[in-house]
């Protein structure tokens, strides 16, 4: 049998946010139901994780031997602390789209570990704020965006923006 440390060396995690409790659930992406040591996990999910606090999970299973895999869960900031804001200026709304992630609340997570991503059509931007210029008037554009913490996606949003009519004579 392999060691659990080896077997689960490349385990990945998804973070799910509960807006009522303001707590995260970490979903462990494994095929079998594992044990989580002191942290109880149900159906490979570790519950009630506080934003921006690290949690250590000791992963074991009867298909592998000691030592267990020690997984450090880097819990992201609360999702409601981010808002996708349309920053398009009214006078330029015929040919411009501006989108910005706003941090309306502070949090204790290291901001260095946060990555923003926008995809508008086939254009990809790794920025917190984007401005698309020279667009076609009266066209619909869809922009998908996500935020990652330590390369784990923890929130996403989409905006469909229709550019205004062009000015007469243009």
């Amino acid at each position: 049998k392999p060691t659990c440390d080896e077997k689960y060396a490349n385990i990945t995690v998804d973070y799910l946010y509960n807006k009522e409790t303001k707590l995260f659930t970490a979903k462990l992406n494994v095929n079998e139901n594992v044990n989580c040591g002191n942290n109880t996990c149900t159906n490979n999910e570790v519950h009630n994780l506080t934003e921006c606090k690290n949690a250590s999970v000791s992963i074991s299973h009867n298909s592998c031997t000691a030592p267990d895999k020690t997984l450090i869960l880097d819990v992201p900031p609360g999702v409601e602390k981010f808002q996708l804001h349309d920053c398009t200026q009214v006078e330029k709304a015929d040919t411009t789209i501006c989108l910005k992630w706003k941090n309306i609340e502070t949090f204790t997570c290291d901001t260095q570990n946060i990555t923003y991503r926008f995809q508008c059509g086939n254009m990809i931007f790794d920025n917190k704020e984007i401005k698309l210029e020279n667009l076609e008037p009266e066209h619909e554009y869809k922009c998908d965006s996500e935020i990652l913490y330590n390369n784990h996606k923890f929130t996403n949003a989409s905006k469909i923006i229709k550019t205004d009519f062009g000015s007469p004579g243009e």
């Epitope: 706003k102 941090n103 609340e105 502070t106 901001t111 790794d126 704020e129 401005k131």
Partner: antibody, heavy 119, light 113 residues
Amino acid sequence: EVQLVESGGDLVKPGGSLKLSCAASGFAFSNYDMSWVRQTPEKRLEWVAYISSGGVSTYYPDTVKGRFTISRDNAKNTLYLQMSSLKSEDTAMYYCARRYDVWWYFDVWGAGTTVTVSS
Amino acid sequence: DVLMTQTPLSLPVSLGDQASISCRSSQSIVHSNGNTYLEWYLQKPGQSPKLLIYKVSNRFSGVPDRFSGSGSGTDFTLKISRVEAEDLGVYYCFQGSHVPMYTFGGGTKLEIK
């Protein structure tokens, strides 16, 4: 190491122009809003310009509006302050400072660069 | 514009004593979102300012717990419970609620009596 390094300060005559630079390193510059803050010879701190992370929004106090322009080049990790129609009251130490968003705080400051406006 | 008035201008203290600095805003700096964006910065001689407190009472990482902030509306206070030699310098309050018109207080110089 997270660092901001200002440069470009000089002695300039009233009515003259000057461009300050602030080189950022050790962090994802394009994710941070940035500001210029100056300190007068009397040691008063004054906020003089603000720019959002992507350069979309800029703000100025009335004392410098129309004379100062803040800009940034995220590809070069550099913040700029173009100053024109300089007055003696613009004499100060100019600091660049990072603020993750408008509702956050200035958590990293540069060491400053000195601008002297005098004939 | 929001005017931030700090008192006293100069504060002579003995090491180990408590120090208290007041900051008053000319109008309420409670934002419509319910938060109050009042910050305190310390500038030591020959250095750039450093953040101590944000949102009235939150200590920035690495700031000793002898520093505490309090207040609401228009009246705010920074307290240092036991002044140490490394605390000497000029303290500035700052309001970030009235975006984008940020304003600093005039500063309070903490010095040895």
